[in-house]
């Protein structure tokens, strides 16, 4: 015959632990149940009775399986400079990510404690090292021969155009300029020309508030500002 | 046009540490950031972290982490590349490499060569 | 991580011919893909970065193309000195991974 299948609560037998989804209760001397996530212990097992549970309530969550007498509360509602990408349920707490243009500067367990704004790179430098979730844009000079006259948070310094004849040689924050004759680009052919405004609004060592208005696609700007360093090394 | 000259080769034995300069010339250290790639003979190129010397800040490779240290001298804008507990497997060639605001790695040094060998 | 792999491992071809080397990342890496050279005893260097920039002094016959996860390096006309090993790297995510590399050799 099977060994006969205990039904909580019951004595477990010296030296055994309890089975999945259940916790031996120190008082009672007994295996017991456990609450479901979204659950918590309302009322203790005894010798003869088992755990009783009851739904969390509003603005508060268990994750796992449990035996606490309250669940736990939900973090504060996200802050401006963040998005909400999971909500509180009874299950789950909420978890707050920073938005476009802003880097966690303080993690949490989940989420994000505190952001900050991704640093701009002012005119004559570009990003070395596009921001992450979790790190900020590393600005550097722009080497020579290649420029950006933006100030922002994703573009990258690019060729100056190479001229037959140069009315203006390129700098670090300015393109070359051409007489009339045609000049070339060193840029590969088919590349996407999408003009966008010029800002100065930062020093490339002072961040500024406002989000990174960078493109999400994969085009390449060669004869606007500098085309954006798209995307970002994550971590 | 910024020049990246590297120390010179060097024979370690198993379980020593092995540290490698990389001097930087005709432009300041803190323009770049300076990258270590490790590149094995005959096999293709590992990238082993960065250094930003402007504000020492490092990243590094998980492979790498546990053993690798990367650190800046700005007042002789010199880079180095210290790599323990050194194995056979580590015998390769080492370049740094300087990235500036072209996001890309613009210069690399001559590269230095480790043989690990008991 | 991501992998990044090129194709062929060696191209045979002539020179004054076109070539096409292909690499293709494991994921969406946008266009944060460079390309770099090594000649046999040399360091890398690079000629095409964030997929189609070429780098400042590098002859126009390098082209760089593509985003997201396919990407080719093209030399128009092969001069006796583009025989070399020719690797792709992506930047979009750490760690930093370059590609086996192809070799480009002569016919």
């Known amino acids: 015959l099977p060994a006969q299948v205990a039904f909580t609560p019951y004595a477990p037998e010296p030296g055994s632990t309890c089975r999945l989804r259940e916790y031996y209760d120190q008082t009672a001397q007994m295996c017991c149940s456990k609450c479901s996530p979204g659950q918590h212990a309302k009322v203790f097992c005894t010798k003869t009775s088992d755990t009783v549970c009851d739904s969390c309530e509003d603005s508060t969550y268990t994750q796992l399986w449990n035996w606490v007498p309250e669940c736990l509360s939900c973090g504060s509602r996200c802050s401006s400079d963040q998005v909400e990408t999971q909500a509180c349920t009874r299950e789950q707490n909420r978890i707050c990510t920073c938005r476009p243009g802003w880097y966690c500067a303080l993690s949490k367990q989940e989420g994000c404690r505190l952001c900050a704004p991704l640093r701009k790179c002012r005119p004559g430098f570009g990003v070395a090292r596009p921001g992450t979730e979790t790190s900020d844009v590393v600005c550097k000079p722009c080497a020579p021969g290649t420029f950006s006259n933006t100030t922002s948070s994703t573009d990258i310094c690019r060729p100056h155009q190479i001229c037959n004849v140069v009315a203006i040689p390129g700098n670090a924050s300015m393109d070359a300029v051409c007489t009339s004759t045609s000049p070339t680009r060193s840029m590969a052919p088919g590349a996407v020309h999408l003009p966008q405004p010029v800002s100065t609004r930062s020093q490339h060592t002072q961040p500024t508030p406002e989000p990174s208005t960078a493109p999400s696609t994969s085009f390449l700007l060669p004869m606007g500002p500098s085309p954006p360093a798209e995307g970002s090394t994550g971590d | 046009e910024v020049q990246l000259v590297q120390s010179g080769a060097e024979v370690k034995k198993p379980g020593a540490t092995v540290k490698i300069s990389c001097k930087v010339s005709g432009y300041s250290i803190t323009d770049y950031l300076l990258h270590w790639v490790q590149q094995a003979p005959g096999k293709g190129l590992e990238w082993m972290g960065w250094i930003d010397p402007e504000e020492g800040k490092t990243k590094y490779g998980q492979k790498f982490q546990s053993r690798v240290t990367i650190t800046a001298d700005t007042s002789t804008d010199t880079a180095y590349m210290e790599l323990s507990s050194l194995r056979s497997e580590d015998t390769a060639v080492y370049y740094c490499?300087?990235?500036?605001?072209?996001?890309?790695?613009?210069?690399w040094g001559q590269g230095t060569l480790v043989t690990v060998s008991s | 991580d991501i992998v990044m792999t090129q194709s062929p491992a060696t191209l045979s071809v002539s020179p004054g011919e076109r070539a096409t080397l292909s690499c293709k990342a494991s994921?969406?890496?946008?266009?944060?893909v460079d390309w770099y050279q090594q000649k046999p005893g040399q360091s890398p260097r690079v000629l095409i970065y964030?997929?189609?920039i070429r780098y400042t002094g590098i002859p126009a016959r390098f082209s760089g193309s593509g985003s997201g996860t396919e990407f080719t390096l093209t030399i128009s006309i092969l001069q006796s000195e583009d025989f070399a090993v020719y690797f792709c790297m992506q930047s979009k995510s750490y760690p930093i991974t370059f590609g086996q590399g192809t070799k480009l050799e002569i016919k």
């Open positions: 490499a300087a990235n500036s605001g072209t996001g890309t790695m613009d210069a």
């Open positions: 994921q969406n890496v946008g266009s944060n």
């Open positions: 964030k997929a189609s």
